[in-house]
């Protein structure tokens, strides 16, 4: 009932609680002398469903048959309307539409840990939309019975608060849950179990790991468990992996040796427990233990490459480069690299430890046969040395790869292709493709990149350290024993017209012709590999088309003669540069008048 209902009543038949799909009769009746003044035909009773009018009747009572009410609660309010006055609330009623409870399904009970209490869960089935009471009953040996009630609107869990003990682990217990509301009741099927069936051990705790003699091959995992635990399962994985390794162990008594861990790797370990081989359930996984395995000496060998540079008639500069070992090969933190340089005939050797770099440069005599060995060292030892005989990598012309080309291949990739050398191609033991950013000054500090390719390959995709709009000097070496041949080409992954033209810095006269000198375009404005320079000239104040001279681009060239200018005529000159994508804007303009005699 809503409000005090002093002026009248609202009655609901058959009940305020009805089954979905049922019809209800709602009657609103005025109490004596509570209608409008004068006579009862003036009474207009109005029925509201929530805040909207749905029916009316003139007189002392209103009768409304209502069907099709939705699940849940619907509020009906009756009001009286008299002529020339506001509506007056008479009374109201809530009608609760729902369904009888379905049979609870999948009743299951567990006790968390040997000291825990028995708690059961079940599936309620579809929502009744009504107040529904659940009663959980547990019966055990010697006619012992426990009962617990739950009055939550969404009840699907109850804890008995009792502890089953392992004194008689095979004794049977039976649980049943009953749901009751105004429209009916229903009971689950009984669930029968023993102590061993329902006790779920607590997850193992106090997990530790020990490496005997700091070795990854002698590793033991330790943990603590509840007293009755018979089985454990262990799972472990490298911290950066999603896949677990799984091990099942019986009667482990809180320890297990692990034999397949990788060195210098952070692992995550978890353990779960069970009381019986085929009864009961596994505990939750323990909290994770994270631990790093010890280092082992590196495996594998460094990939080493080198560059030779002529200094003078007696000396040469050797620059060695090597790539880091992979994590699985390094098997620890690389502390230093050991480089040994040896003259093979005289047996002189020098050894140096390099830290923080993967390159080393030294100057050696141009005479003698030289070899280097490079190895990587961690706290446990060194990798096998990589040995290289220093030779003239481009000396054997017949070993030079032919028809080398470099083409853009998608974003920041260059596809390098070649043909085998003329000399017996089967003599090639491997190809090395080397690339570095092109710097006009031939800067030796520019990082060097390389990759090795099998002798039957005639192409390589280079993608490491490749940037758009940068020109790379690419060399392909064919190596055979202690001989090498090479070919080079310029290439870029992406290009556009240069952003500026060359800056003419001087024009000088030499025997009736002129020599133009210019500054190179800054690398960041070249926008790829330059193909040509163009020198333009025309008579000052003339509207005629300029003449031009196109010069193939060479890295070191920065001057060019022109001999087609007329004496005592003032010319305006400027330059542009071209990539495969197009021509730059003008560089600066310079005026020049050739002083030579007229013919």
């Amino acid at each position: 009932k809503i409000d005090a209902c002093k002026r009248g009543d609202v009655t609901v038949k058959p009940s305020h609680v009805i089954l979905l799909g049922s019809t209800v009769n709602i009657t609103c009746s005025l109490k004596p002398r509570q209608g409008c003044f004068h006579y009862s035909r003036r009474n207009k009773l109005i029925l509201y469903k929530f805040d909207r009018r749905i029916n009316f009747h003139h007189g002392h009572s209103l009768n409304s048959q209502v069907t099709g009410l939705p699940l849940g609660t619907t509020l009906f309010v009756c009001k009286l309307a008299c002529i020339n006055s506001d509506e007056i609330q008479i009374c109201g009623a809530e009608i609760f539409v729902g369904v009888a409870p379905e049979q609870p399904q999948n009743l299951s009970c567990i006790q968390k840990g040997e000291q825990g209490t028995v708690a059961c869960t079940w599936e309620r089935g579809r929502d009744t939309h009504l107040y529904t009471e659940y009663t959980l009953q547990l019966s055990g040996p010697k006619n012992l019975t426990w009962q617990k009630q739950c009055k939550d609107i969404y009840c699907d869990y109850l804890d008995f608060g009792i502890n089953l003990t392992p004194e008689s682990p095979e004794s049977n217990f039976t649980a049943k849950v009953t749901a009751v509301n105004s429209l009916g009741s229903s009971s689950s099927l009984p669930s029968t179990f023993t102590f061993l069936d329902i006790v779920r051990p607590l997850p193992p705790w106090d997990i530790r790991i020990k490496f005997q003699k700091a070795s990854v091959s002698r590793c033991t995992l330790y943990w603590r468990d509840e007293g009755l635990v018979l089985l454990n399962r262990l799972r472990y994985r490298p911290s950066n992996s999603r896949l677990w390794n799984m091990v099942n162990v019986t009667k482990a008594k809180g320890r297990h040796d692990l034999l397949d861990l990788k060195p210098f790797t952070e692992y995550e370990f978890q353990i779960s427990s069970k009381l019986h081989l085929y009864k009961g359930s596994w505990s939750d996984w323990s909290e994770s233990l994270r631990a790093q395995t010890p280092e082992e000496e590196p495996t594998g060998m460094l990939d080493v490459w080198y560059m030779k540079r002529h200094i003078d008639y007696s000396r040469q500069q050797i620059s060695l480069f090597w790539k880091n070992l992979s994590v699985s090969e390094a098997r620890g933190k690389i502390l230093h690299y050991q480089v040994t340089l040896q003259e093979l005939t005289g047996g002189k050797a020098m050894t140096q430890n390099i830290t923080g770099h993967t390159s080393w440069t030294t100057v050696i005599p141009r005479t003698g046969n030289w070899a280097v060995a490079v190895s990587a060292a961690n706290s446990k030892g060194s990798s096998l040395p990589t040995r290289i005989n220093i030779m003239n990598l481009c000396e054997a012309g017949l070993l030079a790869p032919r028809q080398v080309s470099a083409n853009s291949e998608g974003m920041d990739n260059i596809l390098v292709t070649w043909q085998p050398p003329r000399k017996d191609p089967s003599a090639v033991q491997e190809y090395v493709v080397e690339w570095r950013e092109l710097h006009p000054g031939g800067d030796t500090q520019v990082p060097l990149n390389w990759l090795r390719s099998r002798p039957y390959n005639v192409s390589a995709l280079i993608s490491e350290n490749i940037k758009s709009y940068i020109c790379y000097e690419i060399r392909v070496y064919a190596l055979s024993g202690d001989q090498g041949g090479c070919s080079s080409i310029l290439g870029n992954s992406k290009h556009k017209a240069p952003l500026s033209g060359p800056h003419i810095n001087a024009i000088t006269e030499e025997k009736g012709s002129i020599l133009i000198s210019w500054n190179s375009i800054p690398v960041q404005e070249q926008m790829g590999c330059l193909l040509h320079y163009r020198i333009y000239w025309k008579e000052r104040d003339s509207n005629s088309q300029p003449q031009l001279c196109e010069i193939p681009y060479r890295v070191s060239q920065n001057s060019h003669p022109i001999n087609s200018l007329q004496p005592r005529v003032t010319y305006v000159l400027w330059m542009t540069a071209l990539t495969a994508a197009g021509e730059s804007s003008h560089g600066n303009e310079r005026e020049f008048c050739l002083q030579g005699k007229a013919n």
């Epitope: 009018r53 749905i54 029916n55 009316f56 209103l62 048959q65 209502v66 069907t67």
Partner: nanobody
Framework: QVQLVESGGGLVQPGGSLRLSCAAS????????MSWVRQAPGKGLEWVSA????????SYADSVKGQFTISRDNAKNTLYLQMNSLKPEDTAVYYC????????????????WGQGTQVTVSS
């Protein structure tokens, strides 16, 4: 979904009669009081008549009292309006709707409305 379909309108001479029908579907017709509302050209909505859910009580606007009769057949889910002695001022579009009250301003909800039927009274 709710559907109210009016019919029976047309052109009639002054003094003539028409009977409007409204076929209801998509809701429980017998739960609700129903109304006729009309809208004359260039004017606002005007409540005309109402009938309660079981047909035992009716109300009329003063302008049509004694001239129009509202009725319903819950078995056929149909509402009727019998219009006699029609006058030119009865020219309007007539709408069948769920009852919201007996004043023009009560009809702000448009969820239980038909598309209307045109009644034109002219000689």
């Amino acid at each position: 979904q709710v559907q109210l379909v009016e019919s029976g309108g047309g052109l009639v001479q002054p003094g003539g009669s028409l009977r409007l029908s409204c076929a209801a579907s998509g809701f429980t017709f017998s739960n609700y009081a129903m109304s006729w509302v009309r809208q004359a050209p260039g004017k606002g909505l005007e409540w005309v008549s109402a009938i309660n859910s079981d047909g035992t009580s009716t109300s009329y606007a003063d302008s049509v009292k004694g001239q129009f009769t509202i009725s319903r057949d819950n078995a056929k889910n149909t509402l009727y309006l019998q219009m006699n002695s029609l006058k030119p001022e009865d020219t309007a579009v007539y709408y069948c709707t769920k009852w919201e009250g007996d004043t023009d301003s009560d009809y702000k909800f448009k969820d239980y409305w038909g598309q209307g039927t045109q009644v034109t009274v002219s000689s």
